[in-house]
Amino acid sequence: MASAGMQILGVVLTLLGWVNGLVSCALPMWKVTAFIGNSIVVAQVVWEGLWMSCVVQSTGQMQCKVYDSLLALPQDLQAARALCVIALLVALFGLLVYLAGAKCTTCVEEKDSKARLVLTSGIVFVISGVLTLIPVCWTAHAIIRDFYNPLVAEAQKRELGASLYLGWAASGLLLLGGGLLCCTCPSGGSQGPSHYMARYSTSAPAISRGPSEYPTKNYV
């Protein structure tokens, strides 16, 4: 039961991480610039994201512009875009792998195979977490470097946007969730007498698992 609980917690964390990652990638709040002109009337905040930039006037009016040409974009922005999309797709793949091997599914019957699939999904989620972390940390590093560079003009300096914090949260959740999934089956699930009983059983699931591990409401 503890193992099943850890699995559920792990997958919930990774799902939360995936949603955070999606929001982080989509929101145009990676870099935030507070530009105050000579007059307070022209005060404006510029939000820069991976896909678009937005200008928020002091009046509250917001104008967003999607980046025109892919080739004209800086290489680091293109790389951040690619890594974000790849991280999200990798996490989705991890979820599919998990569903195939989850305790509450019947896609795979053999306990060993289920355990291996859950472990694999955990590793995939960890990889997704690392992939999410790279563009976020890279962008944060560039912002901080600019902040402390005396030759970068004040108007060109940026602040860490909400998307970066969401990205860090996403990465943390994916790493934690993936780690939990890896921990639920430390040795490929081949522990205890049930392993041997399953080997000589014609109906392995019925003998190797107690009915309490198969609540009918969780059948897929």
Epitope: P74, D76, A142, N149, P150, L151, V152, A153, E154, Q156
Partner: antibody, heavy 119, light 107 residues
């Protein structure tokens, strides 16, 4: 109008010291990063030092670290460069430079003051 | 230290010509590059920053571009008043270094 006027240059013997000054006017001095850049007789430009607007942070290349000291008096709108242990390779025109709110790099340059290190 | 290799060291062109000066960084400097113009007997003047952005008041015939670690300053139609020395400078990290300069003359 931004005005930067350097003074204090001249002839000095190797190992000697010199203090350059830069009088600033036409802008709010304590709002800007200030720098010194020199131009050698061979017309090469070399960054010498930079100081933050409040004077709390200073940045030097290894070639002058420990020998040159930048400081600023925001009350007097003046930038200083104290040079010691001078070498022949320090011979150059020294420019006082102001940063800008909008533009990166060295935005406004003074007319320069010549420092000659020779025995 | 990051080295800035500027070429050519001198250049002679006719009025109306398209002129390009290049600067190569010894390692990645992103877009942290500025171009300066120094007219005879004058102090240097900032032309371009962040590799492509023109300072207000600089004629639109000047333009900056970047391709990896190679940067270019282009004058689309050379004018007599463009006779000067041009320098590139990186500000990616300390120490900030300049290119050796390009002396531009009119034929």
């Amino acid at each position: 109008e931004v005005k930067l006027v350097e003074s204090g240059g001249g002839l000095v013997k190797p190992g000697g010291s010199l203090r350059l000054s830069c009088a600033a006017s036409g802008f709010t001095f304590n709002s800007y990063t200030m720098s010194w850049v020199r131009q050698t007789p061979a017309k090469r430009l070399e960054w010498v030092v930079t100081i933050s607007s409040g004077g709390g942070r200073t940045y030097y290349p290894d070639s002058v670290k420990g020998r040159f000291t930048i400081s600023r008096d925001n009350a007097r709108n003046t930038l200083y460069l104290q040079m010691s242990s001078l070498r022949a390779e320090d011979t150059a025109v020294y420019y006082c430079i102001r940063g800008d709110y909008r533009y990166d790099g060295f935005a406004y340059w003074g007319q320069g003051t010549l420092v000659t290190v020779s025995s | 230290d990051i080295q800035m290799t500027q070429s050519p060291s001198s250049l002679s062109a006719s009025v109306g010509d398209r002129v390009t000066i290049t600067c190569r960084a010894s390692e990645n400097i992103d877009s942290y590059l500025a171009w300066y113009q120094q007219k005879p007997g004058k102090s240097p003047q900032l032309l371009v920053y962040a590799s492509t952005l023109l300072v207000d008041g600089v004629p639109s015939r000047f333009s900056g571009s970047r391709s990896g670690t190679q940067f270019s300053l282009t004058i689309s139609s050379l004018q007599p008043e463009d006779v000067a020395r041009y320098y590139c400078q990186h500000y990616y990290s300390i120490p900030y270094t300049f290119g050796s300069g390009t002396k531009l003359e009119i034929k």
